[in-house]
Interface confidence: low
């Protein structure tokens, strides 16, 4: 079967749009009408309340919108909805670091129904999104490559769809979890997929499988950058209590969000975060999580690394390939921003067991204690450990080390750390001495060699 | 009320075949998910098979190939055909209803569970 509507065209229910494994169904998206494709545009000039526009000359005239800024769309999901503060939420942090039109896409007449029939809905929803893009470049000469397509969840295939729809030549598409279910494996006509715009970057947050973990997020890469935070499959801080869970730092609603779909949304979470931390979700290139995890993939290499979520389209490497996979951790609540670095601990004093710790001190701020090894403390050996602190220290200006004894030693034992190497993400290093040793529990200071 | 009713188990041979019924009603038959999960004595409760309310069904590694599920919008029902069946298979067969992933009245309803036994 096939349905035609005047301004966005034909609709058919044939394959790869149905009768696919993935999509068994043949079902037809909901009318226009039905689907009620809304604008609502924020800008610098109305960050709290949206004016709706319309792909019509007058309507964006009467409005804010200004033809030499960047037009960020941002599109929600399976049952969500446009005037969701998260949506507003991103906005308002685009405006404390740009002069921007942010309009989100509102598409609950067509997201609040079953999640097949939702599914197909987002054809209609990226087709009116591809009409408002051609529509301020006909009538305004507004160059589709000044527009960037923000979608999460289902919204990040409506993304897709309305850039196939204007045949690649929208800027930027970013998806947030893209749906996995009735995409996953599909042919790249029905997904998103990098040749959507001319640049594709995606955060994976919830790709366990839909069987038997329940994952709504998609696990293939679907992107130029695909970024997998935490490994892409269970977010830190998604794990709490149902009752704290719920009785959330953003409110009750937001809670009962998050004990829902807690892993799925952190991927707009992590984006708005991103958008007021230029460097605290870098992305290191690396054959899986796991490898990353076991520090093998530091520091960045020589051609840097990715900024996950807004800064994504700085790195200079970003359409050299498609598929790039990018791996880093984040906080368990906002801010989520991390940085890395790897501490290397040449050890003196006394043979012992037990564990080092150490905290940076830089010229932007001071970090919390971080664990660097456990075992058989032994002079001259060195141990090395990689963590991701909280705070940007900026430039390294002295480190303090601090150990604790496994045993109760009458003999109080002294230990020291000689040399602390710091190396920060982008590979440089501080070096820092020190000729002392200390007893357990005592900190001890060391500055540059 | 909400409630699911599971049931269709019994005693079978390996090899053999059992359908296993779970009549919902009519609020929670909505869901957008459904499916059957299991639990074998000693160990975690696993899902076995989904499917969305539009019909979209997948499975666990284990019975893929063997185990079909489905559901009868029109009789409120979901079912879960189990074929070629192993001791391995043997467990209490729980029928779950699960609320849009993001809906407010979002809930996780069981069955009570049905016993499944597959002597060899």
């Known amino acids: 079967k096939e349905v035609c509507y005047e301004r966005l065209g034909c609709f058919s229910d044939d394959s790869p749009w149905s009768g696919i494994t993935e999509r068994p169904l043949h079902i037809l998206p909901w009318s226009p009408k039905d689907v009620n494709t809304r604008f609502l545009l924020y800008t610098n000039e109305n960050p709290n309340n949206f004016q709706e526009v319309a792909a019509d000359s007058s309507s964006i005239s009467g409005s804010n919108f200004k033809t030499n800024r960047k037009t960020r769309f941002i599109i929600h999901g399976f049952i969500d909805k446009g005037e969701e503060n998260w949506l507003a939420n991103v906005c308002k942090n685009l405006f404390k670091v740009e002069s921007v039109n942010c309009i989100c896409v509102d598409w609950k007449g067509g997201s609040r129904t079953g999640y097949t029939q939702a599914s197909q809905n987002i054809r209609i929803v990226g087709a009116e999104v591809a009409y408002f893009v051609e529509f301020l470049q006909s009538a305004f000469g507004y160059s589709p490559s000044n527009v960037h397509v923000i979608g999460h969840s289902l919204g990040a295939h409506a993304a897709g769809e309305a850039g196939r729809r204007t045949n690649g030549t929208i800027g930027r598409i970013t998806g947030l979890d893209p749906a996995e279910p009735c995409f996953q494996g599909t042919p790249e006509l029905v997904r998103l997929d990098p040749s959507d715009a001319k640049f594709v970057d995606v955060i994976h947050t919830d790709g366990a499988p839909i069987v038997p973990n329940l994952g709504f997020g998609m696990s293939q890469v679907v992107g130029h950058l695909d970024f997998f935070p935490n490994g892409g499959v269970e977010m830190p801080g998604c794990k709490k209590n149902i009752l704290s869970q719920i009785v959330d730092i953003d409110g009750i609603w937001e809670g009962t969000r998050d004990f829902a779909a807690c892993n799925h949304l952190r991927s707009y979470k992590y984006y708005t975060d991103s958008i007021v931390n230029p460097d605290g979700f870098a992305g290191f290139p690396c054959a899986s999580y796991n490898v990353f995890t076991a520090n093998k993939c530091f520091p960045c290499p020589s051609g840097g690394c990715p900024q996950m979520g807004h800064y994504a389209d700085r790195y200079p490497g970003k359409t050299n390939d498609v598929g790039q996979k990018f791996y880093l951790d984040t906080g368990d609540a906002s801010n989520f921003a991390r940085w890395r670095y790897k501490v290397s601990v040449t050890l003196s004093g006394k043979k012992v067991t037990g564990h080092i710790l150490v905290s940076l001190f830089g010229n932007k701020g001071n970090s919390k204690q971080y664990e660097i090894f456990k075992g058989t403390l032994k002079p001259d050996s060195t141990h090395s450990n990689e963590f991701d602190s909280d705070v940007d220290v900026g430039d390294l200006q002295m480190v303090k080390f601090i150990w604790y004894n496994n045993v109760i030693n009458p003999t109080l034992p002294r230990v020291g750390a000689s040399k602390i190497i710091v190396e920060t993400n982008v590979g440089k290093q501080f070096n820092f001495c020190s000729p002392e040793t200390v007893r357990e529990e005592v900190l001890l200071t060391l500055t540059p060699c | 009320q909400v409630q699911l009713q599971d049931s269709g188990g019994g005693l079978v041979q390996a090899g053999g075949s059992l359908r296993l019924s779970c009549a919902a009603s009519?609020?929670?038959?909505?869901?957008?998910?459904m499916g059957w999960y299991r639990q074998a004595p000693g160990k975690e409760r696993e899902a076995v098979a989904r499917?969305?309310?539009?019909?979209?069904?997948s499975y666990a590694d284990s019975v893929k190939g063997r185990f079909t599920i489905s559901r009868d919008n029109a009789k409120n029902t979901m079912y879960l055909q189990m074929n070629s069946l192993k001791p391995e298979d043997t467990a209490v067969y729980y029928c779950?209803?699960?609320?849009?992933?993001?809906?407010?009245?979002?809930?996780?309803?069981w069955g009570q569970g049905t016993q499944v036994t597959v002597s060899s």
């Open positions: 499917i969305t309310r539009g019909g979209t069904t």
């Open positions: 779950n209803a699960r609320r849009s992933n993001y809906d407010r009245s979002w809930g996780d309803y």
């Open positions: 009519g609020s929670i038959f909505s869901s957008d998910l």
